[in-house]
């Protein structure tokens, strides 16, 4: 039975040209995290495998930095980066857990972080 929950940074906003950290945290399970995949709608941003290291998709290589930890730093933000991001935790023996983050990239300097929330 899958007992874990993913805690994410929830709905976040950031300024155009700035950077943002996408972060998820898996709790309430003793399952071993073997890999975390980061995706944006229909494309892969990055994979962090505990043993094989990081894979950064070529379309994001210039502006995605691994970390901190299992998270991902997205740099040089554009309005086109607005949308849903997913962290997919591959675990043993539970299977996969998915968290969702919605990022809004704003033209103005008024960019506030949303509240943290949980997805079962």
């Amino acid at each position: 039975m899958m007992t874990g929950t993913i805690e994410t940074t929830g709905n976040i906003s950031a300024e155009k040209g700035g950077s943002i950290i996408l972060q998820c945290h898996l709790s309430s399970t003793t399952a071993q995290v073997t890999q975390v995949n980061w995706e944006q709608q229909d494309q892969l941003l990055a994979i962090c495998n505990a043993d094989l290291g990081w894979h950064i998709s070529p379309s994001f290589k210039d502006r995605v930095a691994p970390g901190p930890g299992l998270g991902l730093t997205l740099q040089s933000l554009t309005v086109n980066d607005t949308g849903e991001y997913f962290c997919i935790y591959h675990t043993y023996p539970d299977g996969t857990y998915t968290g969702r983050i919605f990022l809004e990239v704003l033209e103005s300097s008024v960019a506030e972080h949303g509240a943290r929330f949980q997805i079962p």
Epitope: N37, L44, L52, W54, H55, I56, H90
Partner: antibody
Framework: QVQLVQSGAEVKKPGASVKVSCKAS????????MHWVRQAPGQRLEWMGG????????RNNQKFKGRVTITRDTSASTAYMELSSLRSEDTAVYYC????????????WGQGTLVTVSS | DIQMTQSPSSLSASVGDRVTITCKAS??????VVWYQQKPGKAPKLLIY???YRYTGVPSRFSGSGSGTDFTLTISSLQPEDFATYYC?????????FGQGTKVEIK
Amino acid sequence: QVQLVQSGAEVKKPGASVKVSCKASGYTFTENTMHWVRQAPGQRLEWMGGINPNQGGNRNNQKFKGRVTITRDTSASTAYMELSSLRSEDTAVYYCARSGLRDYAMDYWGQGTLVTVSS
Amino acid sequence: DIQMTQSPSSLSASVGDRVTITCKASQHVSTAVVWYQQKPGKAPKLLIYSPSYRYTGVPSRFSGSGSGTDFTLTISSLQPEDFATYYCQQHYSTPWTFGQGTKVEIK
């Protein structure tokens, strides 16, 4: 230029073990993950596992149920794959392959090592 | 494990033909797909990755596309040196898995 040079062909009896080496040159050995892929006659390629030469962490294909051990000697820029409890269906060409820096695509491959398991 | 299924398993074509090979994953693999070319007795060579980027030195007649579960490798105008076996591979999750291969033969 990047080169991966593997050890020579081996003939083994069922139940024995084989250890294949892969000597890397032309790049910084500890920066790229090394993988082992095998191909039985007329069959598809099969990923056996990979090792991060920097910290030694490795991920193996559970299909092999602990029969595969992947190691490395950073001072010799060499990766090793040992397969134990050999059976006839392990007869295959075994390749080492390097994946790119922060990229999982396997961009350079060794020449292959034929391992024949026969009584 | 994720299964990768290629079609067709083999095809016969002439020099100058447009050739399309498809690869279907048994579950979502996003864009974590790579294509390799292999000639008899030789190691595979990286062709296309992620899944539409040509590897260094690969001719522009090779192209790749797809996302999710369905992927395509296209050779726009087949050349004599392109007769080989082509494999797709996913690295979305371990164990990494390959398709069964598509052998491109001379008609």
